[in-house]
């Protein structure tokens, strides 16, 4: 079952799916001046069996000015534009994608791919949020949103994440700014879809990246 809406937006935050549930579709979008090849797929589809999942179909783009089809080539790093919120950059991913049955990895880029990836998520999909550079989270723990089915309708849970800029902080004389201690982090509230391993990795990220302190949904 496809999720009706996109994951919720949070001010000054981006989200990313660390793995994609079977049934997820990714539109084959091309950058300006290019289009899908005539017989090309409209989308890639995450499919699989109990032991292995992968993306069916391949996206291929060709110049709008020519009739020739282009072969699918992975662009060089400098050619890869920053993608939209579903592709947030981080030094390590909170989930070992290969270890999640029924999920696909991030699809590799294709030549002349659009700068934004448009995914169609399915019920049960989880996305993780982090504050954009220059903003910090007011909460601690993993920030996630899950697409759930309730009373026959799909909805995304609201991630408990507030990202604030340093310039907004109000500190006054005599009010000392405490230092966040990386030690003794209490266990986050658990979610049925987050494993201990996920959270440990996320807290490691939090310790190394001020702007990527993930936070958990408040139930």
């Amino acid at each position: 079952e496809l999720c009706d809406d996109d994951p919720p937006e949070i001010p000054h935050a981006t989200f990313k799916a660390m793995a994609y549930k079977e049934g997820t579709m990714l539109n084959c979008e091309c950058k300006r001046g290019f289009r899908r090849i005539k017989s090309g797929s409209l989308y890639m589809l995450c499919t699989g069996n109990s032991s292995h999942s992968s993306w069916d179909n391949q996206c291929q783009c060709t110049s709008s000015a020519t009739r020739n089809t282009t072969k699918q080539v992975t662009p060089q790093p400098e050619e890869q534009k920053e993608r939209k919120t579903t592709e947030m950059q981080s030094p390590m991913q909170p989930v070992d994608q290969a270890s999640l049955p029924g999920h696909c990895r991030e699809p590799p880029p294709w030549e002349n791919e659009a700068t934004e990836r448009i995914y169609h998520f399915v019920v049960g999909q989880m996305v993780y949020y982090q504050c954009v550079q220059g903003y910090r989270a007011l909460h601690r723990g993993p920030a996630e949103s899950v697409c759930k089915m309730t009373h026959g309708k799909t909805r995304w849970t609201q991630p408990q994440l507030i990202c604030t800029g340093e310039m907004e902080t109000s500190q006054f004389p005599g009010e000392e700014k405490p230092q966040a201690s990386p030690e003794g982090r209490p266990e986050s509230e658990t979610s049925c879809l987050v494993t201990t391993t996920d959270f440990q990795i996320q807290t490691e990220m939090a310790a190394t990246m001020e702007t990527s302190i993930f936070t958990t949904e408040y139930q």
């Epitope: 601690r140 408990q160 500190q171 966040a180």
Partner: antibody
Framework: QVQLVESGGGVVQPGRSLRLSCAAS????????MAWVRQAPGKGLEWVAV????????YYADSVKGRFTISRDNAKNTLYLQMNSLRAEDTAVYYC?????????WGQGTLVTVSS | DIQMTQSPSSLSASVGDRVTITCRAS??????LNWYQQKPGKAPRRLIY???SLQSGVPSRFSGSGSGTDFTLTISSLQPEDFATYYC?????????FGQGTKLEIK
């Protein structure tokens, strides 16, 4: 089940101080941002102050900046609001709240009356 | 600070009526808007977040729409328990700000 219980309200003269407390239970207090919201009698709602999970970031409404201080004691699961140089316009019910993005849990509120 | 202006400030309606309350922001707040319901002597209760997402447990007769600076809360068929004061609130930037409220009364 989340429970937030405010205390410390009362009648105070202009220019004096008061400290409000909010005892929290039913969730991992030290993981969550907390806030104070107030509502003057018969009036609307106003965010007063917000504090991050570890107390390292604090945000205040312009109307209370320099007079009010929000703080927390994670070991005691308690949120505080130190109110100095109180004015008549600070008269309100003060609510402690958390779950700032996902539905907000509120306390029952404590009434602060500033009057001579 | 971003000012939030609600209209009307009060309105009378009957059970079964369709009611619309509007909220205007002094500058764009994207879709970062909440709607609350408050009854006398009680803390506010959030009905809608992100302009149009229904809070869990809130009846589907409540809906929200809009973007940028203009937003609406609609109650499709008023029920007796819906008579209360409604507030919009932006969370695009601190300080978060509320509208002045709309008091919904029984006609």
């Amino acid at each position: 089940q989340v429970q937030l219980v405010e205390s410390g309200g009362g009648v105070v003269q202009p220019g004096r101080s008061l400290r409000l407390s909010c005892a929290a239970s039913g969730f991992t207090f030290s993981n969550h941002a907390m806030a104070w919201v107030r509502q003057a009698p018969g009036k609307g709602l106003e965010w007063v102050a917000v504090i991050s999970y570890d107390g390292s970031n604090k945000y205040y409404a312009d109307s209370v900046k320099g007079r009010f201080t929000i703080s927390r004691d994670n070991a005691k699961n308690t949120l505080y609001l130190q109110m100095n140089s109180l004015r008549a316009e600070d008269t309100a019910v003060y609510y402690c709240t958390t779950g700032l993005n996902s539905g907000y849990d509120w306390g029952q509120g404590t009434l602060v009356t500033v009057s001579s | 600070d971003i000012q939030m202006t609600q209209s009307p400030s009060s309105l009378s309606a009957s059970v079964g009526d369709r009611v619309t309350i509007t909220c205007r922001a002094s500058q764009s707040i994207n879709s970062f808007l909440n709607w609350y319901q408050q009854k006398p002597g009680k803390a506010p209760r959030r009905l809608i977040y992100g302009t149009n997402s229904l809070q869990s447990g809130v009846p589907s007769r409540f809906s929200g729409s809009g973007s940028g600076t203009d937003f609406t809360l609609t109650i499709s068929s008023l029920q007796p328990e819906d008579f209360a004061t409604y507030y919009c609130q932006q969370y695009n930037s601190w300080p978060w700000t509320f509208g002045q409220g709309t008091k919904l009364e029984i006609k």
